[in-house]
């Protein structure tokens, strides 16, 4: 189809080479006053909707995205050619950064109901550049945490080194919906609830003498509980003695619950005490067996190929530790009678 009639938008994605980061394009189809065909069943040209990307009409809940090859070849369907780009309704998600994402992206409704609708399309010219500005060492991350129940803020990564006074007007979106009251480079949250988590997008306009473009950054915000104030607890073994059969293989499992910590360095290990001697045992790797918002359960097993008489004189000790403290649980083996 002829894309010469598409409205055009220029965007800049400056990505940090230090961190994983994502990017999104919204299918910002023209507002009714620009092209009433895009929303013709919803609003008269006089009615101006709240400007939400892709929210103007049910007809637009499904759009087609294309990329325009730089060599002038025909438009390519995004879904067929680009596995690192995912389409979610009217949003295009770029899962990995890189200058190879630069290019022209076109979106239009799948359902073209009249000849006029052909012009109902948007061409987005995306320029992708690695961040070179070293002067801003502490720019905000593209992954930000909010502590549940406390005050917090979400900073626009591309503007976080500027003071509020210097900052241009910013347009914020949360999960694709416009946050119309937010205009500064930082969103302040008075009290954090779990619904504050999501994908936030901040846009601001930059221009030179020739043209203007939108600088966009994407922030993944998660809500977290406060760091635990408790040392880990051992859920298994509970008993300090274990009945065993001599000559048989044995696996003793240690399962420990660690409270949430933002910097999580759990320790779980087995050691053996034999009279005055004590040594750590080489055992299989620890593995997570459950994770929830508030805690994680980690398991580590000690495996004896066969239980010997000597093992009955030893104590097998599971040791667990986090930044708060440590806990141990010892197990003495006892021969099963009868």
């Amino acid at each position: 189809f002829n894309i010469s009639g598409c409205s055009t938008k220029k965007l800049l994605w400056t990505y940090s080479t230090r961190s994983e980061e994502e990017f999104v394009l919204f299918c910002d189809l023209p507002e009714p006053q620009k092209s009433h065909f895009c929303h013709r069943n919803r609003l008269s040209p006089k009615q101006v909707p709240e400007h939400l990307p892709f929210m103007g009409s049910n007809d637009l809940s499904d759009v087609q995205w294309y990329q325009q090859p730089s060599n002038g070849d025909p438009l390519e369907d995004i879904r067929k050619s680009y596995p690192h780009i995912i389409q979610d309704k009217c949003t295009l998600h770029f899962l990995t950064p890189g200058v190879n994402n630069s290019g022209s992206y076109i979106c239009r409704p799948k359902m073209i109901k009249s000849p006029y609708d052909v012009a109902c399309c948007v061409k987005m010219i995306l320029e992708v550049k690695p961040q070179t500005n070293a002067s801003c060492e502490y720019s905000a991350s593209h992954k930000q945490d909010l502590l549940l129940g406390s005050t917090g803020s979400i900073s626009c990564p591309s503007l976080s080194c500027q003071s509020d006074a210097q900052s241009p007007a910013v347009t914020w979106y949360k999960n694709g919906k416009l946050l119309s009251v937010e205009r500064s480079n930082r969103i302040v949250v008075d009290e954090v609830y779990d619904y504050h988590q999501g994908t936030y997008v901040c846009d601001y306009t930059q221009s030179d003498t020739v043209s203007s473009w939108t600088v966009r950054a994407v922030v993944q915000v998660r809500t977290i509980v406060g760091d635990t104030k408790l040392k880990p607890d051992i859920l298994d073994p509970v008993e300090d003695t274990l009945e065993v059969e001599l000559g048989k293989p044995l696996t003793i499992s240690c399962k420990a619950r660690f409270g949430f910590e933002r910097v999580f360095n759990p320790v779980i290990k087995w050691y053996i005490k034999d009279s005055d001697l004590e040594w750590e045992v080489s055992v299989p790797e620890a593995k997570s067996i459950k994770s929830t918002l508030k805690d994680e359960i980690i398991e580590r097993n000690i495996i004896l190929e066969k239980v010997t008489q000597r093992d009955l004189r030893r104590k097998f000790v599971c040791f667990v530790q986090n930044s708060i403290g440590n806990t141990t649980q010892s197990v003495q083996l006892k021969e099963k009678r009868g």
Epitope: K143, N175, G176, D194, Q197, G198, T199, Q220, V221, R222, T223, V225, L235, D236, K255, S288, I289, K290, S291, T292, L293, K294, D295, E296, I297, E299
Partner: antibody, heavy 116, light 111 residues
């Protein structure tokens, strides 16, 4: 909302990937589970991708399925489908503080039929 | 793996009456309370009713009540309505998520 896609008729042994797409929330902040239901039968727990990003599979499902997550989708791959894998596959969001059974948001399901 | 055994199906209830469904686990659930109840109607996905053994999910009428701890749990529907005709499933979470399971389901028929 969550929406499953990718269900279709496949022949036994042909790998199949189902996709769960989230709208209105970020998958990074939630556990996401997969559950299936054979025609006329009960619900069967397949596995869950926990909030830490680690995936946990039901004992019977280990080695038969893989679950992987991005910020917008959760995929369930049926590695070597058999006729017993014919079912509607549901994706669901987990919201519990200390639980992974609190599945509050479910998709409509996608039907997988395995037949030669 | 854990096994959850539910009251055999179907269970009949009169409109306005009370119905109880039991769910027994072969091992203790995590924290003694990691048990949820779901309602499913034909052609629809399951709907969360109760989590944490006794906490009512958002938007669920107060006539649904969950109780129990450890290995034995009950879902009670009082003042049964026609709309409550459905299959009900319990779901248990355990120390190891690999043991998580659903019960076999109990069909409630409203007369």
């Amino acid at each position: 909302s969550v929406e499953e896609s990718g269900g279709r008729l496949v022949t036994p042994g042909t790998p199949l990937t189902l996709t769960c797409t989230a709208s209105g929330f970020s998958l990074n902040s939630y556990a996401m589970g997969w559950v299936r239901q054979a025609p006329g039968k009960g619900l069967e727990w397949i596995g869950i991708n926990g909030v830490s990003g680690t995936t946990y599979y039901a004992t019977w499902a280990n080695g038969r399925f893989t679950i992987s997550k991005t910020s917008t989708t959760v995929d369930l791959k049926i590695i070597r489908p058999t006729t017993e894998d014919t079912a509607t596959y549901f994706c669901a969001r987990g919201v519990g503080d200390t639980t992974d059974t609190q599945l509050d948001l479910w998709g409509q399901g996608t039907l997988v039929t395995v037949s030669s | 793996a854990a096994v959850l055994t539910q009251t055999p199906s179907p269970v009949s209830a009169a409109v306005g009456g009370t119905v109880s469904i039991s769910c027994q686990s072969s091992q203790s659930v995590y924290n003694d309370n990691d048990l949820a109840w779901f309602q499913q109607k034909p052609g629809q996905p399951p709907k969360l009713l109760i989590y944490g053994a006794s906490t009512l999910a958002s938007g669920v009428p107060s006539r649904f009540k969950g109780s129990g701890s450890g290995t034995q749990f009950t879902l009670t529907i009082s003042g049964v309505q026609c709309d409550d005709a459905a299959t009900y499933y319990c779901s248990g979470g355990y120390i190891s998520s690999s043991d998580n399971a659903f019960g076999g389901g109990t069909e409630v028929v409203v007369k």
